[in-house]
């Protein structure tokens, strides 16, 4: 069991003037790579 | 059930290396990120590093940084920190843990092994 | 650095007591916050995260609250096993820190 707070996604981060490549910088599991180039994607 | 199983602690003398390991069972090592953290005798928790999937990102504290170092073995399910230029404040018991993400809380934590620095 | 000042460093409590400890962050960090439960030589045991959850099989006298700076763990009625030192961490940023913890002592 566990888990935790999930994390914001992405979009808000970037509203908060964070960079891609530091939001990249933070990314831990696999999941959280996924998201990330998921939403690259989908920015296109 | 999710185990982490830590090994390679013991006495070293200032300056020389130890390396440390978390084996882990029970869940997909190779999907998560995982961290070490440490606790000098009769003080409180410090982070140490952190190594994401498939060992893209390493973050380390300050005090480590350039010293120690966090890495991975998928095909083993093993986690290492290699320690060098080791310095009497790096005694400490280390743990390693799991968490679910970037920005999850912790879950699981290993049983924690203890590095003493002296000469 | 985030620094996380977690009060008191110590308190004296008797069975039954509602106990409550407080842990603030030098910066907003949402509810990016984790409570643990440690006893003397085992590992920290993971009781809350995101400031209010409840991890899986921890009791429900534990709770948790707080958002952005102030946060606080309440234990409702302590019992003879709640007796040992609990730490708040903070996961919104590298490097991720703790509180320097309370140490719930038997009164």
């Known amino acids: 069991g566990g888990g935790g707070s999930k994390h914001k996604c992405v979009q808000n981060s970037l509203v908060n003037n964070e960079t891609l490549e530091s939001i990249m910088n933070t990314l831990e599991s696999e999941e959280d790579f996924r998201k990330y180039f998921y939403y690259l994607e989908g920015s296109k | 059930q999710v185990q982490l199983v830590q090994s390679g602690g013991g006495v070293v003398q200032p300056g020389r290396s130890l390396r440390l390991s978390c084996a882990a069972s029970?869940?997909?090592?190779?999907?998560?990120?995982m961290h070490w953290v440490r606790q000098a005798p009769g003080k409180g928790l410090e982070w140490v590093a952190v190594?994401?999937?498939?060992?893209?990102?390493?973050h380390y504290s300050d005090s480590v940084k350039g010293r120690f170092t966090i890495s991975r073995d998928d095909s083993k399910n093993t986690l290492y920190l290699q320690m060098n230029s080791l310095r009497a404040e790096d005694t400490a018991v280390y743990y390693c843990?799991?968490?679910?993400?970037?920005?999850?809380?912790?879950?699981?934590w290993g049983q924690g092994t203890l590095v003493t620095v002296s000469s | 650095d985030i620094q996380m000042t977690q009060s008191p460093s110590s308190l004296s409590a008797s069975v039954g007591d509602r106990v409550t400890i407080t842990c603030r962050a030098s910066?907003?960090?949402?509810?990016?916050l984790a409570w643990f439960q440690q006893k003397p030589g085992k590992a920290p045991k993971s009781l809350i995260y995101?400031?209010?959850s409840l991890q899986s099989g921890v009791p429900s006298k534990f709770s948790g609250s707080g958002s952005g700076t102030d946060f606080t763990l309440t234990i409702s009625s302590l019992q003879p096993e709640d007796f040992a030192t609990y730490y708040c961490?903070?996961?919104?940023?590298?490097?991720?820190?703790f509180g320097g913890g309370t140490k719930v002592e038997i009164k």
């Open positions: 910066q907003g960090i949402s509810n990016y």
């Open positions: 029970g869940f997909s090592f190779s999907s998560f990120g």
């Open positions: 190594i994401s999937y498939g060992g893209i990102n390493k």
């Open positions: 961490q903070q996961y919104n940023s590298y490097p991720l820190t």
């Open positions: 843990a799991k968490r679910e993400g970037y920005r999850y809380a912790y879950d699981y």
């Open positions: 995101g400031a209010s």
